[in-house]
Interface confidence: medium
Amino acid sequence: PEPPTACREKQYLINSQCCSLCQPGQKLVSDCTEFTETECLPCGESEFLDTWNRETHCHQHKYCDPNLGLRVQQKGTSETDTICTCEEGWHCTSEACESCVLHRSCSPGFGVKQIATGVSDTICEPCPVGFFSNVSSAFEKCHPWTSCETKDLVVQQAGTNKTDVVCGPQDRLRA
């Protein structure tokens, strides 16, 4: 019979013959012959192959380097790579998450609109009138000014976006 020029899915052509590809999690040891099947071996510890393949070497799992702020989000298997993410307080510098940077803090006068995640930085917003923040934080929102009236006091010093109002006693001489 004519030697094949194309093979079925999950097969490959070698020496005018269709051989079975190795399944995910296994690597190729030897091609099939007229008389033998393709020989495959499982990937070793800390190795993987995620497709039907004819690779002679498995890929190494990604290393989540703690010195780069990385930690393991999902441990790799023989069929999947390790997924890294950033430690709390850090976020990935790229989609591949090869390293991390520290979340930005919101300076005094600004509050946290959205706390950072493993993939996105802190979002800060200016404290609007009636609110303040006197801290540099990646977590704290703007706080409302103290309501002197509810404490039966009066405003002695106006608040700013960085400072709370200062309350004082009522002037009893006034009507």
């Epitope: 010195n67 780069l68 702020g69 307080g89 390293s99 991390c100 940077v101 520290l102 979340h103 930005r104 803090s105 300076s107 005094p108 930085d121 006197n134 801290v135 540099s136 934080s137 990646a138 977590f139 704290e140």
Partner: nanobody, 120 residues
Framework: EVQLLESGGGLVQPGGSLRLSCAAS????????MKWVRQAPGKGLEWVST????????YYADSVKGRFTISRDNSKNTLYLQMNSLRAEDTAVYYC?????????????WGQGTLVTVSS
């Protein structure tokens, strides 16, 4: 000048407890998020826990969650780390760090560290 002085480390048996302190000076302590990091022998820095400026928000590494508690006393300019159910793998030099605004590791200001050894 920013100064951070850790204390409270020592030798403790597995399952035991320790409380670390960090006395801060040279900056407005109550205005900054603070954190603890550690370095085990022959290993890189590992983040342990973070506390927000007011103390309302706390965060922990998975490896210490449920065992360690971070807290602060802004009136005393002091950061604490209560460590319970200690394990051999908690052996490390522990540093407190003032959280920088943004950027790459390492952390901006940290103390000289205090050694915690967990061994029977």
């Amino acid at each position: 000048e920013v100064q951070l002085l850790e204390s409270g480390g020592g030798l403790v048996q597995p399952g035991g407890s320790l409380r670390l302190s960090c006395a801060a000076s040279g900056f407005t302590f109550s205005s900054y998020d603070m954190k603890w990091v550690r370095q085990a022998p022959g290993k890189g820095l590992e983040w342990v826990s973070t506390i927000s400026a007011s103390g309302v928000f706390t965060y922990y590494a998975d490896s210490v969650k449920g065992r360690f508690t971070i807290s602060r006393d802004n009136s005393k300019n002091t950061l604490y780390l209560q460590m319970n159910s200690l394990r051999a793998e908690d052996t490390a030099v522990y540093y407190c760090a003032k959280r920088e605004h943004a950027g790459q590791p390492p952390f901006d200001y940290w103390g000289q560290g205090t050694l915690v050894t967990v061994s029977s």
